[in-house]
């Protein structure tokens, strides 16, 4: 009797005939910016307060017939998905609705901006508990709308938005492209990305995760007891807003960065069929389907990390790409990736008082991506140690020499265009895990961090014959912070982290001869925090 979508987001330990996870988000208020809603529907009656905010454009067409049930359809359904009695995710959450979409589901950037400002002012006048803002709408890229979302997020509000239903790169839409917003794509009961007519869910690096978004049961505005199935990334975003409300109700002090990391951590991994996405978007799109944590408490001991991809650099010779972590996150490693294999590596550098990850394109290259590994590491003190090109036969080396600092990531950057061609591989001397090793013509950057109880170890996986992909994963209890390839593998396209696995990609094996250069070694740096583990044990 449980709708498929609620079953999908529920960890096995909660599963019974009915969906009844502990604490329904009762400490959290969810703001919904959408159409008008039918607030007397039995599913949401008494749970949703309709504010007096309304800022919508006129409906198109002279013959448009405004029918209440049609005007309320989208918003009523979403309110039900978030907090409905029968088919809602966070049955205890209270909601407030703002009307920014008209009866045809159309709105304006200015109307949405004014709505966000209304929420900000309400928050200042009457501060309550944690706030979640659900934006189940998408329009063309808007710098001003993204900036407004950033301001609200930095004021401590969690914003959740739909990726958009255009079967396109979510980065081309707002507010989906705002980095501070949690952007949600849609999947169906078969864990396939949702197709909607000739279009479907958006995808790409601006999507944080996916959630159920096809045939979602929710309140229908046709009558006060009616229910209907609706589909789209709006429905997917409503699931994540509900999950966020549940998590924040259990841990009201969670920051946006902590919440996002938890959403990613507790998601189902690698269940989406990526063949649906355009080939160039597959590596950028997170293969994550949102789920409730198995227990609403006790996740504090884990070291949480996520992978952040930059925008594409473009093909010019000196083009660079920059990946940034959120304000509350630490950049623990930096890597790069180029489909053509022509790149000049990457480096961690300070920008505005924060470390960023910058990747460099090479002459003749089609462009690069920078890939940041962004982690939650309280009381961390991280720095980058750089060794210039050594010009010595043993290659370039750099290690963490400060007392108590551990190596969390290695990057290498070079000026020459054809680094590594016809050069034998440089092997890391055993028993020296706290150092980065690179080509003699490359500068090497070590990310060195000190944090209470932080310990890290290096794990390698080498394959002597050419392989398009080599992976190495951190074991249970350890978190991947760094991912790189050992030097000597000139055909490497780059390295990146997928969940807890380091992936090193190489050129198509048919184009690389089976020489010594065919050897590919993936290097993972796996860390854990004993301090966080002890702290959480004390709290329980």
């Amino acid at each position: 009797s449980i709708p498929w979508n609620l079953e999908r987001i529920t960890p096995p330990r909660y599963r019974a005939d009915e969906y009844q996870p502990p604490d329904g988000g009762s400490l959290v208020e969810v703001y919904l910016l959408d159409t008008s809603i039918q607030s007397d529907h039995r599913e949401i009656e008494g749970r949703v307060m309709v504010t007096d905010f309304e800022n919508v454009p006129e409906e198109d067409g002279t013959r448009f017939h405004r029918q209440a049930s049609k005007c309320d359809s989208h918003g009523t359904h979403l309110a039900g998905v978030v907090s409905g009695r029968d088919a809602g995710v966070a049955k205890g959450a209270s909601m407030r609705s703002l009307r920014v979409l008209n009866c045809q589901g159309k709105g304006t950037v200015s109307g949405t901006l004014i709505g966000l400002e209304f929420i900000r002012k309400s928050q200042l006048v009457q501060p309550v508990g944690p706030l979640v803002v659900l934006l189940p709408l998408a329009g063309g890229y808007s710098r001003v709308l993204n900036a407004a979302c950033q301001r609200l997020a930095r004021a401590g509000v969690v914003l959740v938005t739909a990726a958009g239903n255009f079967r396109d790169d979510a980065c081309l839409y707002s507010p989906a492209s705002a980095p501070e917003v949690i952007t949600v794509g849609a999947t169906n009961a078969q864990d396939q990305p949702v197709t909607l007519g000739t279009l479907g869910t958006n995808f790409g690096r601006c999507v944080d995760l996916f959630a159920p978004g096809e045939d979602i049961i929710g309140a229908s505005s046709d009558c006060s007891t009616c229910f209907v199935s609706q589909s789209g990334t709006s429905q997917a975003a409503a699931h994540v807003a509900g999950i966020a409300a549940m998590m924040l109700s259990a841990e009201p002090e969670l920051t946006l960065a902590e919440l996002r990391q938890r959403l990613i951590h507790f998601s189902a991994k690698d269940v989406i069929n990526e063949a649906w996405f355009p080939e160039d978007q597959r590596v950028l799109t997170p293969n994550l389907v949102a789920a409730l944590p198995p227990s609403t408490h006790g996740a504090g001991w884990q070291l949480f990390c996520r992978t952040v991809w930059s925008a594409h650099s473009g093909p010019t010779r000196m083009a660079t790409a920059v990946a940034r972590c959120a304000p509350d996150e630490e950049l623990l490693s930096c890597s790069s990736f180029s489909r053509s294999g022509k790149r000049r590596g990457e480096r961690m550098e300070a920008q505005g008082g924060k470390l960023v990850c910058r990747a460099h394109n090479a002459f003749g290259g089609e462009g690069v991506y920078a890939i940041a590994r962004c982690c939650l590491l309280p009381q961390a003190n991280c720095s980058v140690h750089t060794a210039p090109p050594a010009e010595a036969s043993m290659g370039t080396r750099v290690h963490c020499h400060q007392q108590g600092h551990v190596l969390t990531g290695c990057s290498s950057h070079w000026e020459v265009e054809d680094l590594g061609t016809h050069k034998p591989p440089v092997l890391r001397p055993r028993g020296q895990p706290n150092q980065c090793v690179g080509h003699r013509e490359a500068s090497i950057h070590a990310s060195c961090c000190h944090a209470p109880g932080l310990e890290c170890k290096v794990k390698e996986h080498g394959i002597p014959a050419p392989q398009e992909q080599v992976t190495v994963a951190c074991e249970e209890g350890w978190t991947l912070t760094g991912c790189s390839a050992l030097p000597g593998t000139s055909h490497v396209l780059g390295a990146y982290a997928v969940d807890n696995t380091c992936v090193v990609r190489s050129r198509d094996v048919s184009t690389t001869g089976s020489t010594s250069e065919g050897a590919v070694t993936a290097v993972a740096i796996c860390c854990r925090s004993r301090h966080l583990a002890q702290a959480s044990q004390e709290l329980q």
Partner: antibody
Framework: VEESGGRLVTPGTPLTLTCTVS????????MNWVRQAPGKGLEWIGA?????ATFFASWVNGRFTISKTSTTVDLKITSPTPEDTATYFC???????????????WGPGTLVTVSS | AAVLTQTPSPVSAAVGGTVSISCQSS???????LSWFQQKPGQPPKFLIY???TLASGVPSRFKGSGSGTQFTLTISDVQCDDAATYYC???????????FGGGTEVVVK
């Protein structure tokens, strides 16, 4: 399970059919309405769950409503047309679900004729 | 909407023989929630099988349901005269408005 209220009505005249149950509680089961035009197959109309939630086939388009009391389930045909001429059945779903699963108990049906 | 297509009627079966009726769905049936019903003229349908293969209480084991996804089959072995009836499958996909019955298959027993 027993249906009642079926009769001859003129097109456009609202008609309410009632399904009366005994021996079990509507607070534990979903109830479905299914119809069968003369000489034709079965057609699912809609259902009401124990919670009171109602849902309908996509072809319904607001032509029917379902409601219930502690022992009865009503199907209202808001504006009957001759195409609504059929025997209307009420059936219990032991799964109390959103998807047809176990329609284990059926009433004998009640005949509705819509004609001018 | 999900469309359930059944074996065209009528299907003939000899007493003691075996008859199979297929039910194909245009969309994957959610959780294999596919049911089979038997209906005789002037009577309401009788519940035979649920979840594609689970026999309803009191139904003889001669009736067997199988299949998953979009393709399902009802098999009646050791056919009896009393099995002459129209058989319907019912189910739906994840859209709650797509619950539906198949068109029915009449079984004639010789």
């Amino acid at each position: 399970v027993e249906e009642s209220g079926g009769r001859l009505v003129t097109p456009g005249t609202p008609l309410t059919l009632t399904c009366t149950v005994s021996g079990f509680s509507l607070s534990s089961y979903a109830m479905n309405w299914v119809r069968q035009a003369p000489g034709k197959g079965l057609e699912w109309i809609g259902a009401i769950r124990s919670s009171g939630a109602t849902f309908f086939a996509s072809w319904v388009n607001g032509r029917f409503t379902i409601s219930k009391t502690s022992t009865t389930v009503d199907l209202k045909i808001t504006s009957p047309t001759p195409e609504d001429t059929a025997t209307y059945f009420c059936a219990r779903d032991t799964n109390d679900g959103w998807y047809i699963n176990r329609l284990d108990l059926w009433g004998p049906g009640t005949l509705v004729t819509v004609s001018s | 909407a999900a469309v359930l297509t059944q074996t065209p009627s009528p299907v003939s079966a000899a007493v003691g023989g075996t008859v199979s009726i297929s039910c194909q769905s245009s969309k994957s049936v959610y959780s294999n929630y596919l049911s089979w019903f038997q209906q005789k003229p002037g009577q309401p349908p009788k519940f035979l099988i649920y979840k594609a293969s689970t026999l309803a209480s009191g139904v003889p084991s001669r009736f067997k349901g199988s299949g998953s996804g979009t393709q399902f089959t009802l098999t009646i072995s050791d056919v009896q005269c009393d099995d002459a009836a129209t058989y319907y499958c019912a189910g739906g996909d994840t859209n709650i408005s797509d619950n539906a019955f198949g068109g029915g298959t009449e079984v004639v027993v010789k």
